[in-house]
């Protein structure tokens, strides 16, 4: 596999990761697929410092992150442990609210206008952030 040593054009480098900030919205799954096709993933927030960095770039706009509970427990898309990891939920969130009338609960996490997190309907077309780590060997399959 190859290693990414610098960030692609239009991406922002921070603490050995590259970040890309959308300026339009997509449903969570479509945003997730976009990131994957860029050899990245929806942003995984592992520290207060990273939270502040992302918050600074997105401003007061609802923005998807790589956290969901569509299969039961809350999971980060890159496998980072949710239970022991950084969290920044709004008070009384996540609440898996069913009162929105769109069917089902709320299974995808996003940054709210103040940066704290909320769970919401995954189909809402919010902005999103992709992240990829520098110096990480790519997933390119070995040549046979």
């Amino acid at each position: 596999g190859s290693e990414r040593t610098c960030c692609p054009v239009n991406w922002v480098e921070h603490e050995r990761s590259c970040y890309w900030f959308s300026r339009s919205g997509k449903a969570w799954a479509d945003a997730d697929n976009y990131c994957r096709l860029e050899d990245a993933h929806l942003v995984v927030v592992t520290s207060w410092e990273e939270q502040k960095f992302v918050q600074h770039h997105i401003g007061p706009v609802n923005t998807w992150m790589g956290l969901h509970d569509q299969n039961g427990p809350w999971k980060w898309v890159d496998g980072t442990d949710y239970e022991t990891g950084f969290k920044n939920w709004r008070p009384e969130q996540p609440d898996d609210w069913y009162g929105h009338g769109l069917g089902g609960g709320e299974d995808c996490a996003h940054f709210t206008d103040d940066g704290r997190w909320n769970d919401d309907v995954c189909q809402r077309p919010y902005r999103w952030v992709c992240e990829t780590e520098l110096d990480k060997a790519s997933q390119e399959p070995p040549l046979l």
Epitope: G1, P8, V9, Y34, D39, P125, Q139
Partner: antibody
Framework: EVQLLESGGGLVQPGGSLRLSCAAS????????MSWVRQAPGRGLEWVSA????????FYADSVKGRFTISRDNSKNTLYLQMNSLRAEDTAVYYC?????????????????WGQGTLATVSS | DIQMTQSPSSVSASIGDRVTITCRAS??????LAWYQQKPGKAPKLLIY???SLQSGVPSRFSGSGSGTDFTLTISSLQPEDFATYCC?????????FGQGTKVEFN
């Protein structure tokens, strides 16, 4: 200059296999996602499959899932489409296309360069 | 899957005419739409992306508009090299899907 050159098309019987190749030049191949798009005779375009720059993430249309495999060899600047269990309805010109060279960072993957296509005919 | 429906399927026009082609998505796709031009026996060529952004090198007589589900491609003054088939494509979600195409023919 960006160039994409497909090959590997031909006549095959139903149930048979073909392997299409797309040789690329003029850009840093491993940095860009790529797709296969097909066009049946006299019909519209149909997206078939996409692959990320590293080859680590792949996506397929339901019509080919489980039968077709997209892959790439970044050391050879070549994209592949392995087509198995072929059906008459797979008969088409197959184009390889690249995403994001001229149109980067928009939040969507558009097909901004295309090859000239290779014809795969499935018939008994 | 998101269905993309173009109208008309063909249009007859003359040099200098203003030509308008519409594309409707079966679901909301924001502005994640592209327009392509294809000539017989040739590969498609990207004209417009993100509904209204003109691809580099494409003449300014081509323009795109719309968002949500309804989109339009306009050729402000048809030129001889513009006789071709035009199709739209949604890039909102997998599977990416195309319209069936609109053929611009000489009147």
């Amino acid at each position: 200059e960006v160039q994409l050159l497909e090959s590997g098309g031909g006549l095959v019987q139903p149930g048979g296999s073909l392997r299409l190749s797309c040789a690329a030049s003029g850009f840093t191949f491993s940095s860009y996602a790529m797709s296969w798009v097909r066009q049946a005779p006299g019909r519209g375009l149909e997206w078939v499959s996409a692959i990320s720059g590293s080859g680590g993430n792949t996506f397929y249309a339901d019509s080919v899932k489980g039968r077709f495999t997209i892959s790439r060899d970044n050391s050879k600047n070549t994209l592949y489409l392995q087509m198995n269990s072929l059906r008459a309805e797979d008969t088409a010109v197959y184009y390889c296309a690249i995403h994001g060279i001229a149109v980067a960072g928009t939040g969507a993957h558009y097909f901004d360069y295309w090859g000239q296509g290779t014809l795969a005919t499935v018939s008994s | 899957d998101i269905q993309m429906t173009q109208s008309p399927s063909s249009v007859s026009a003359s040099i200098g005419d203003r030509v308008t082609i519409t594309c409707r998505a079966s679901q909301f796709i924001s502005s994640w739409l592209a327009w392509y031009q294809q000539k017989p026996g040739k590969a498609p060529k990207l004209l417009i992306y993100t509904a209204s952004s003109l691809q580099s090198g494409v003449p300014s007589r081509f323009s795109g508009s719309g968002s949500g589900t309804d989109f339009t491609l306009t050729i402000s003054s048809l030129q001889p090299e513009d006789f071709a088939t035009y199709c739209c494509q949604q890039a909102n979600s997998f599977p990416w899907t195309f319209g069936q195409g609109t053929k611009v023919e000489f009147n």
